[in-house]
Amino acid sequence: VPRWRQQWSGPGTTKRFPETVLARCVKYTEIHPEMRHVDCQSVWDAFKGAFISKHPCNITEEDYQPLMKLGTQTVPCNKILLWSRIKDLAHQFTQVQRDMFTLEDTLLGYLADDLTWCGEFNTSKINYQSCPDWRKDCSNNPVSVFWKTVSRRFAEAACDVVHVMLNGSRSKIFDKNSTFGSVEVHNLQPEKVQTLEAWVIHGGREDSRDLCQDPTIKELESIISKRNIQFSCKNIYRPDKFLQCVKNPEDSSCTSEI
């Protein structure tokens, strides 16, 4: 008789999840020699330990503490790039601007990027069929709690000028319910962070509006100012040209507005 299994509303654990996490850890330590002290098998064991045999709606930040400890990493605190709803461009930017880091450029962010995972209460099985959806099922699921935990730690580590890339094509350029809006904004440390600089990325070719005047950006400015952090905002009218100019800053066309 097949055992009854909880049916969740979200997609199940990414196939080859254990193999992918282990392989990513090995790749990361190859690419970042400063992280060679990390034992990838221990990292996987700690990752697994955070959610295996636990009810996937009952996960806490505490569950991830062993993994957080193993993945402790120092990134230059003044070189942090946050993003909201525009991950690909943020990653293209840090690929070129090598001294800046998104969360996914850190070991823990890299391990989990684009993956889904969950277990089942009282069994050591990984659930490849379905996992809880944040809205439809529960917010304290393994994936959401992981990102909340690492995002909070990443924001807490930031200092000086922190940059955030925002998607100007969305109805809510700044969304209070995004990870940036609900976690990172509230965990920037006013005693360390001087300024949050928002880069609003335009989508349309002919879009010359000043999206820094958008009501949601004004809302972000208000939240940040109340936290005693300065706020500045720049329009990035041509993201393609922006990236090109990061690659080749001496190009003559890079002096004009991008």
């Epitope: 193999e19 992918t20 392989a23 790749k27 190859e30 690419i31 020699p33 990653h91 690929q95």
Partner: antibody, heavy 120, light 107 residues
Framework: QMQLVQSGAEVKKTGSSVKVSCKAS????????MNWVRQAPGQALEWMGW????????DVAQKFQDRVTITRDRSMSTAYMELSSLRSEDTAMYYC?????????????WGQGTTVTVSS | EIVLTQSPATLSLSPGERATLSCKAS??????VDWYQQKPGQAPRLLIY???NRYTGIPARFSGSGSGRDFTLTISSLEPEDFAVYYC?????????FGGGTKVEIK
């Protein structure tokens, strides 16, 4: 079994470009960083750069920064190394190579090599 | 970048003799040094990883030692198939770098 199979020998003119391919099989292509190493006749080995096939992120040795582009095609499990503005000193054997989990960060796996000859 | 200096450039020995190859790094590379053997017309073959670990299938006559800046590859008793060029490589710091090689030839 694990294999890295490279494209055939190339003869190129000075100033032109060459694109060498490395087809991986016998393992999950995205699970390992792919490195490129070259060796001029009678000379030592020289590391050129790597690509993370999962995301396409690359790093290239300073010496080759302006001339080397490393790419991949995930659907074909193939990595590519393109070298532009060829000069006679680029005449060499070009290898792709990768590490193996639990074997440090050395390269136990190598392609058979691709000979590139640059002539004026 | 880290420079690896291998010595001697050539080692002339007879089968059965002991070969000692040196690799010196221009700065500390911890234990992140690997040794390769290369024969004419062939790709390099990994012998030793992380300074002292023999790779799978490598005969026990090959051993590696050292850490920091000084590394040694020892072949306890040379077999006819061991005459080749040997390279050290460091993976501690980007870019990876190789030594200039030591040719072990038959005396």
């Amino acid at each position: 079994q694990m294999q890295l199979v490279q494209s055939g020998a190339e003869v190129k003119k000075t100033g032109s470009s060459v694109k060498v391919s490395c087809k991986a099989s016998g393992y999950t292509f995205t699970d390992s960083v792919m490195n490129w190493v070259r060796q001029a006749p009678g000379q030592a080995l020289e590391w050129m750069g790597w690509i993370d096939p999962e995301y396409g992120r690359t790093d290239v040795a300073q010496k080759f920064q302006d001339r080397v582009t490393i790419t991949r095609d995930r659907s074909m499990s193939t990595a590519y190394m393109e070298l532009s503005s060829l000069r006679s000193e680029d005449t060499a054997m070009y290898y792709c190579a990768r590490t193996k989990y639990n074997s440090g960060y050395g390269f136990p796996y190598w392609g058979q090599g691709t000979t590139v000859t640059v002539s004026s | 970048e880290i420079v690896l200096t291998q010595s001697p450039a050539t080692l002339s020995l007879s089968p059965g003799e002991r070969a000692t190859l040196s690799c010196k790094a221009s700065q500390n590379v911890d234990s992140d040094v690997d040794w390769y053997q290369q024969k004419p017309g062939q790709a390099p073959r990994l012998l030793i990883y992380k300074a002292s670990n023999r790779y799978t299938g490598i005969p026990a006559r090959f051993s590696g030692s050292g850490s920091g800046r000084d590394f040694t590859l020892t072949i306890s008793s040379l077999e006819p198939e061991d005459f080749a060029v040997y390279y050290c490589m460091q993976s501690n710091t980007h870019p990876r770098t190789f030594g200039g090689g030591t040719k072990v030839e038959i005396k």
